[in-house]
Structure formats: C-alpha cells, structure tokens
Amino acid sequence: LQDLCSNCPAGTFCDNNRSQICSPCPPNSFSSAGGQRTCDICRQCKGVFKTRKECSSTSNAECDCISGYHCLGAECSMCEQDCKQGQELTKKGCKDCCFGTFNDQKRGICRPWTNCSLDGKSVLVNGTKERDVVCGPSPADLSPGASSATPPAPAREPGHSPQ
C-alpha cells in the first residue's frame, strides 16, 4: 500500500484521523518539508526577542534581539546585553577595558593592544580603550640618518585626467 503521506506538501500534515488526507497546518504552526505527520509550533518572539520574520505555514518565525542586546547561537537562541565600545561584558555587567586592552565593538572581550616592537615597529598612534595602537615605521627608519628621498608621484588611475 502506497504511503499517501509522502504526497502532502510543506504547509500541510498527513491527518491519520482523516484517511491520510493532507490537512493545512493549524494557526501558529508550520511544516517546512513534505510528508510530515504533524506540524511544528511556531516560535514566539517575545520578551527580549522581537520578530524578524513572521511564521508562515511553511517556515518558522525568526527572531532578533531587542535594542541593546545581540543574538547568540544558532537561529538567535539567546540574547546577550550589548556594551559600549571600550567595554566588555563580565559577570557584573559591562566594565571598561583595563589599560593596555581595547574593544572596538559592542560585544566580545577586551583584547591587548598590538605590541609594535615585536614587528620591529614603533607606536605611531597610542591605543585607547576603544582602539588598538597604530604601528608605524621602525625606530631605525625614523632616525636622522635615514634616507629622505622624495617619494615617487602616485600613479594615476587609467581614465582619470589630472586635476
């Protein structure tokens, strides 16, 4: 005997109570594949979640986090508090980055400033809580005896006439 359920498309379920007739998914439920014997309950985006995409008969709702929070995990399974740039989230809430570290995002941890000297370079711009240091030429390149030849003129892009 052929399984009639395999003919039921997404958005329906195979109703065993009605001789394997394909019945539409009830309100607030969906089936994303054919041949389903039940429909799944739609996800509700409430509390710290807000709806990014409404549930339909063939696809689940998709949630985002409310303002001030960001998604974590597959399909935004959790919301985590944002912090300001220059901070990181600790068990006691958002805390400023310690000296020598920075965070240029609203999430994640404070990371150490780049150590320019490891690359034989000098610090061109000091780091802050929000920004990494900018490394410049090596100290040797900046010494008075270093060559000071005129840099070559920048090449013009083809098709651009001189100003």
């Epitope: 509390g47 710290v48 974590l72 399974s77 919301c79 989230l89 068990k91």
Partner: nanobody, 123 residues
Framework: EVQLVESGGGLVQIGGSLRLSCAAS?????KYWMIWVRQAPEKGLEW???????????YYVDSVEGRFTISRDNANNSLFLQMNSLRAEDTAVYYC????????????????SGQGTRVTVSS
C-alpha cells in the same frame, strides 16, 4: 511550554522594601542561571542581577549592589529579588529571565522572560 510569572510589585515609599518572586515552569529550573532585568519608563532593558544554578554565585549591577539580594528556591522552582532602601530610580517593570545552562554559549545571555511586575517608588 516554558513559563516565567513575576509577582510582588507595587507602590512603595522611597527607602522602603519589596520582595519580587518569579515562578518557573516547563523546564528544569535547577539547571539554569536566572536573571532579573528591569525596564524604566522610556529606557532600555537593564540587567539587574543574576544567580547561578545552586545559588553560590550572585552578581549585581553596581547601582543596586548592597541594596538588592537575588536568591532562588530550586525545590519550588522559584526566583526572588529582595529590594531594600528603594530609590526613585528603581521605578521600573521588573522581569525574570532564564539564563544559560552549563552548555550554553553564554551565562549572560537570556532566552525566555516573563511578562513583568511593575515597581513604583515614590516620595
């Protein structure tokens, strides 16, 4: 279905006290961190305090440290927030929320919250 239901809010004088409760159902309460957050009028959602699974770790936002105490009763699937020395700036809707378990991506994240209970602190 996971459910969190807050109670215990109300109108209180500055300097007064309130004890909020949160009844949890639909999940294994003792496996999750739990969180209190609040939303003051015209403000965003603010994290207030959280507590780990067995109640041995508790953390508070600086503005409530020493005045608020978070606790839990795993046998009765309940979360509490004892609020003392209340200030006008504590006026908000308070929500309890479920945090992560030992396998979650974050202990600071939350995935379910209740409908909230309103606390009004007036002079």
């Amino acid at each position: 279905e996971v459910q969190l239901v807050e109670s215990g809010g109300g109108l209180v004088q500055i300097g007064g006290s309130l004890r909020l409760s949160c009844a949890a159902s639909g999940f294994t309460f003792s496996k999750y961190w739990m969180i209190w957050v609040r939303q003051a009028p015209e403000k965003g959602l603010e994290w207030v305090a959280n507590i780990n699974q067995d109640g041995s770790e508790k953390y508070y936002v600086d503005s409530v440290e020493g005045r608020f105490t978070i606790s839990r009763d795993n046998a009765n699937n309940s979360l509490f927030l004892q609020m003392n020395s209340l200030r006008a700036e504590d006026t908000a809707v308070y929500y309890c929320a479920r945090g992560g378990d030992d396998y979650s991506i974050s202990h600071f994240g939350m995935d379910v919250s209740g409908q909230g209970t309103r606390v009004t602190v007036s002079s």
